[in-house]
Structures are given as C-alpha cells and as structure tokens.
Amino acid sequence: MAERAALEELVKLQGERVRGLKQQKASAELIEEEVAKLLKLKAQLGPDESKQKFVLKTPKGTRDYSPRQMAVREKVFDVIIRCFKRHGAEVIDTPVFELKETLMGKYGEDSKLIYDLKDQGGELLSLRYDLTVPFARYLAMNKLTNIKRYHIAKVYRRDNPAMTRGRYREFYQCDFDIAGNFDPMIPDAECLKIMCEILSSLQIGDFLVKVNDRRILDGMFAICGVSDSKFRTICSSVDKLDKVSWEEVKNEMVGEKGLAPEVADRIGDYVQQHGGVSLVEQLLQDPKLSQNKQALEGLGDLKLLFEYLTLFGIDDKISFDLSLARGLDYYTGVIYEAVLLQTPAQAGEEPLGVGSVAAGGRYDGLVGMFDPKGRKVPCVGLSIGVERIFSIVEQRLEALEEKIRTTETQVLVASAQKKLLEERLKLVSELWDAGIKAELLYKKNPKLLNQLQYCEEAGIPLVAIIGEQELKDGVIKLRSVTSREEVDVRREDLVEEIKRRTGQPLCIC
C-alpha cells in the first residue's frame, strides 16, 4: 500500500514537472523525455480498482466519424477529386510515417509539432506533418522531374487544437501539386483557379484568396533592416496579422524577437497594405523595394499572375496581401491562402476572415534538399483544409435540419407474408448480381410495417414486395416509399425498372 502511495506521489510530481516544462517552453527533447518518464511511472502504477474506471474516449485532437459525418465527408471529397481530375492530375500515396530525417529542417518553427514514433528497431520515425514534404521525397527518390498529382490522406500535428473550429491533431489534407520546369506563373495560376473552383462548388460561403510572394517578403525585410537570421521568425510574427492587431505583432517582434522598434515600424508600413494588381504596380514604383532584386522578381511574377487570373475569371476573388507570410520554411515564391468571409456587421466595413480553408504556394527548393546533387525540381501546389470545410458543411446541414442519407440502398426486398425468407434471399441475390444496391431485414418473418418504416428512416426510395400471389403470377410488387404507389412488375423486368427509377445506367460498365 505504501508502495502504491509512493508511486502515486511520483506520478503527481512528474505530472507537475511536465506541465512546468511545457509552461517554460523547455526544449522538445527534454519535454519528450519527461513525458516518457511519466508514462513509465503510470504504467507501473497500473489500474487502481478503487479509482474511476478507464474513460473511453478518442485521444486528444482526434474524433470518430459517424455515418452521417462520413456521408458529408464523401460528398466533399467527391467535389474535390472531380476537380483535381478535371485538371488532369494523377494520384499517389505515401507512407503515413517517414524517416525522422526526411521531415527535419523543413518546417521551421513548426518542427516542434511533429509526432515522433517510439524507436522501432533502429529507424527513427515520425508521422507525416503534411503531404508536401513526402511528395518532394517521392520525386527525389524516383528521380521524377515532371508530374501533376493529387494526394488525399491524413496528416498529424502535435498542436493544441480548438476542435470546435475544425482543428485536430489528426486530419485530412487534400493536396494538388504541379512539379516541373514551366513558363512562369502558368501552373501557379491554375492552382489558384482550382482553389476557387473547389471553394465555389462546395457552396460554403463567400471567400477571398490572399496572395503574396516569399521573395517580396524577404526583399521587404532586407530593405527594412531585418538581419537574415531573423527573416523566418519575423515571418511567423507577420503571419499572425490576420488574427491579432498590428500593435500585438509589433510587440512580439520587438519584445520577444529583439527587433528594433524603427525596423518594426518600417515593416508595418508595408505589411498593412493589401489590394489588387494596382498595389503590385504601386510597389514596382517603390524607390526602395524596386531596388531589391528578390522583391522585384516577385512583383514581376505577381503582375504576370494577375494577368492569368483575369483570363481565368477569378481576379475578383484574389487580394494581394503583404501580411501573408505562411509559416512553412519551404516556400520560395508565390504563396496563397483562402479565407472564408463573414458578412460585415455594417455596410462599408472590411469583410472579416474566419480562418483559412485552403492554402499553398511555390516551393522550388524542397526536392533539391533530398537530391544528393541538390538538383532542383520547381513545384507549386495547394492544400484544401477539408476538416474545417467538413465542420462548416455539417453545421450548415444541421441549421437547415436537412436529412442526409448515410447509405445508397436503392431497394429493400420485403415480404408481405410469413415463410418467404428463401424467396427474399433469392431475389436480393439476383439484384446484387445485377449491380443493384439492395438490402433485406435479417428476420425470418418481418412485419411489412416494420420493413416500410426501415425504408423511411434510411431514405430507401423503393420496396420490392414478394407475396404468395405475386410468386404465382411471376411478378414483384414495386412500391415507391414516398408516393406509396405500387405497381406489379414482371420479375425479369425488375432490374431494368429499378435502374430506370433510380437513374442508374442500365449496364454496369
């Protein structure tokens, strides 16, 4: 008993130690070691029968998908995949875990959010953080210089998620990327077109795509007096401007990141600007910015991009925003992020963003990081933030109290009398063999009312009713669940009649 009390005390102390280290923002390695110790102590403690039983739940930042949620998810995926295929993309898949080395040094300050796996026989492994780095590894490994691909899969981040806003530790990403040497801004414009097509098709509300360029950011930082070593960390501060005020961002840059106040003010003059192609033109005339080679290249490309976006008919959805500084280290050129807009409280106010639903950019150097000779494969891509979209679609359907079908069953094989199980089994098998989505109730003698009720609840449109008289006459009674009208259909015509009524092609091609 004393032993257990001692262990409980140590578990408590170790828990406090871990919390303290997290609050102090101690190194990831130290926190990881102390968490491992805590888990070992807890394991030795074992279950305590006197304590409350094990709480059955999914791990923090994860969730189960109910049939209803899965139906929503499949509809969303269907819209996205159709769009990706319409644009000529192939599909690939990669392992859910990568060698830790593959992911290291690719995400900047976000690296601390990577999930490391416990040692599995020598290889240090991590769960993938996104689909882009594995894609770059795939290109380098297979010596590919040209591909247009999409990849839909789960990724993992040790974030502290606000799940109510559609943020998780395990979540899907839907990525589309174009790899290869092409003329400037054509693939980039297509990525933005795809983003707009998908967000419009999903009908989740009005959206805006913010566009910037890493080279413009870097050039701007250089002329404002930010040292090279601080570029990335200042980037991550600037990127918060969509969530907090300039004052807060400035305080962070000056107070926490050691930037001189006058340098921060110079940055502020730039990053608080947003507009369209006219802002690009204006900055091309900026006496300081136009003298910076990187910024000039970026501005030139953005001018060209806006031309293509106009031809694609989406320029009204795009805003050049100098505060967009996506956190990932691998971006080298154009970067973009789509945000949903809330309706402004009063007319004349700026539209308010409610979080990113898609993002992407150009990353010309990432593949080269994996190539022994450093050979670069230019890439540009986008990622759809489907978890947030699922949340929005679910909320919208709940508000509309819309019934969602969770199965695709076209017909229920039913019987009106007892002792017809064998006939039901024969008929349902015929229907399955003909490619009809059919079900039957798993009871020998179900009541007709129960069978009809099941159809109502499951949204099954048709019932094929077998009766003794129908068997003698060689017909099946086909009943429409909603209109309740019944017709006798010859057994040999039943498949064709069901397909006709449910709008299914007459052959399984």
Epitope: A6, L7, E9, L10, L13, Q14, E16, R17, E33, A36, K37, K40, L41, Q44, K118, D119
Partner: antibody, heavy 120, light 107 residues
Framework: QVQLVESGGGLVKPGGSLRLSCAAS????????MTWIRQAPGKGLEWVSY????????NYADSVKGRFTISRDNAKNSLYLQMNSLRDEDTAVYFC?????????????WGQGTLVTVSS | DIQMTQSPSSVSASVGDRVTITCRAS??????LAWYQQKPGRAPKLLIF???SLQSGVPSRFSGSGSGTHFTLTISSLQPEDFATYYC?????????FGQGTKLEIK
C-alpha cells in the same frame, strides 16, 4: 535479488583512457535508467551521467562532457562508461546505480564501486 | 545548477536520541528529494525518496519531511547501526546534485 558489480577501475596517467563496466542481475535491466555517480577520496557524491533503458536519452555533468561516454548493452545486462582524456580531478570511486521506479533520478540500488586513480 | 546545503556538517548523539538533519535547496524542488546513508568503504543506501516516502526495507524510525527548498531527515530513536554519513540529493533537474554530507558520530 538486485545486484550491480562494477569493474575496470585502476591507475591511469592524465590524458589516458579507461572503460568501466557494470554487470547487472536480478531485475529487468532494459526497463531501468542507469547512472554513474562518483565520489572523490574523502569527498561528497557527484552525479556523472545517466542513460535511459531504450538508449534514447543520455546526459553528462559539465565536468565530463565531451570526454566521457555512457552506453549500455541490454542483451548483456551491462552498463559502460568510456572515460577519455582523464584528469587528476577524475580520481574517485565510481558507482553504478539503478534509478528508483525505473525513471526517477534517485539510486535505489548501487554497486560496491570501482576506484579510478589518475596520476602521473 | 541547484545547490544543496546540509546542516549541521557533523553531529554527535547517543543511542536512543532523536536526531534531525536539515537540507536546503538553492531553488524550489517541490518534493524531488532523496536521503542516503553511507558507511565508510560502502556504497550509499537509499533511505527516503520523494521527500517523505520510506524506501522498502528501511526501518520506520527514519522519516523525511519538507517541500520546496527546506527538508529534514529525522531519526526518532538512534540505533548503533545508524552512525554514518547522510546525504541529501535533489532529483528535480539535471545535474542532480548532492548535499556535502552530515556525519553522525557517537557522543
């Protein structure tokens, strides 16, 4: 019963090297963090280094960092301390010890110690 | 590094006496403290861990208390085999440090 037996101590010249071993028995060696602690003649105790059961975590006192390397062989139930560039002030009895409750940095079982003398 | 200071550095007592040894930490260490007993030419022996938990097999006359920066080891009734040097050790953060020791001698 738990037993820890150190070996490998002896007389060595400054700048020389020595490898200490600690043979463990009577417990599941791979479950436990292990540590080396030393005691200079007539002095107090000094924590030198530790290693986790899975080899993943190690640490060293500043006074030995870069010169000493801790390692273990779980198959042989053995703990090691490779000591290079030895100095006079490394002269001490070196004890290996097991962490209490596998992971708590307190030695619940200690070896009898092995004497390392660094002298020209 | 966290400094551990023991007092007194030596104490003389008789069999049956109650003895208290104090250990102070240079910063708060919660209850991450252990007490050891060491006899000449022998390895230290763990008495108390987590400031007040008695290691199995250690007589109940030994007890520990305290948390934060101030800790005590108490021997309620000294026995002949208790004459030795006692060390405290913090297990809060690496490098884990020991007190300089308190020598308990026969009066």
């Amino acid at each position: 019963q738990v037993q820890l037996v150190e070996s490998g101590g002896g007389l060595v010249k400054p700048g020389g090297s020595l490898r200490l071993s600690c043979a463990a028995s009577g417990f599941t060696f791979s479950d436990y963090y292990m540590t080396w602690i030393r005691q200079a003649p007539g002095k107090g105790l000094e924590w030198v280094s530790y290693i986790s059961g899975s080899f993943r975590y190690t640490n060293y006192a500043d006074s030995v960092k870069g010169r000493f390397t801790i390692s273990r062989d779980n198959a042989k139930n053995s703990l090691y301390l490779q000591m290079n560039s030895l100095r006079d002030e490394d002269t001490a009895v070196y004890f290996c010890a097991r962490y209490v409750y596998q992971v708590v940095a307190i030695g619940d079982y200690w070896g009898q110690g092995t004497l390392v003398t660094v002298s020209s | 590094d966290i400094q551990m200071t023991q007092s007194p550095s030596s104490v003389s007592a008789s069999v049956g006496d109650r003895v208290t040894i104090t250990c102070r930490a240079s910063q708060g260490i919660s209850s991450w403290l252990a007490w050891y007993q060491q006899k000449p030419g022998r390895a230290p022996k763990l008495l108390i861990f987590a400031a007040s938990s008695l290691q199995s097999g250690v007589p109940s006359r030994f007890s520990g208390s305290g948390s934060g920066t101030h800790f005590t080891l108490t021997i309620s009734s000294l026995q002949p085999e208790d004459f030795a040097t006692y060390y405290c050790q913090q297990a809060k953060s690496f490098p884990y440090t020991f007190g300089q020791g308190t020598k308990l001698e026969i009066k």
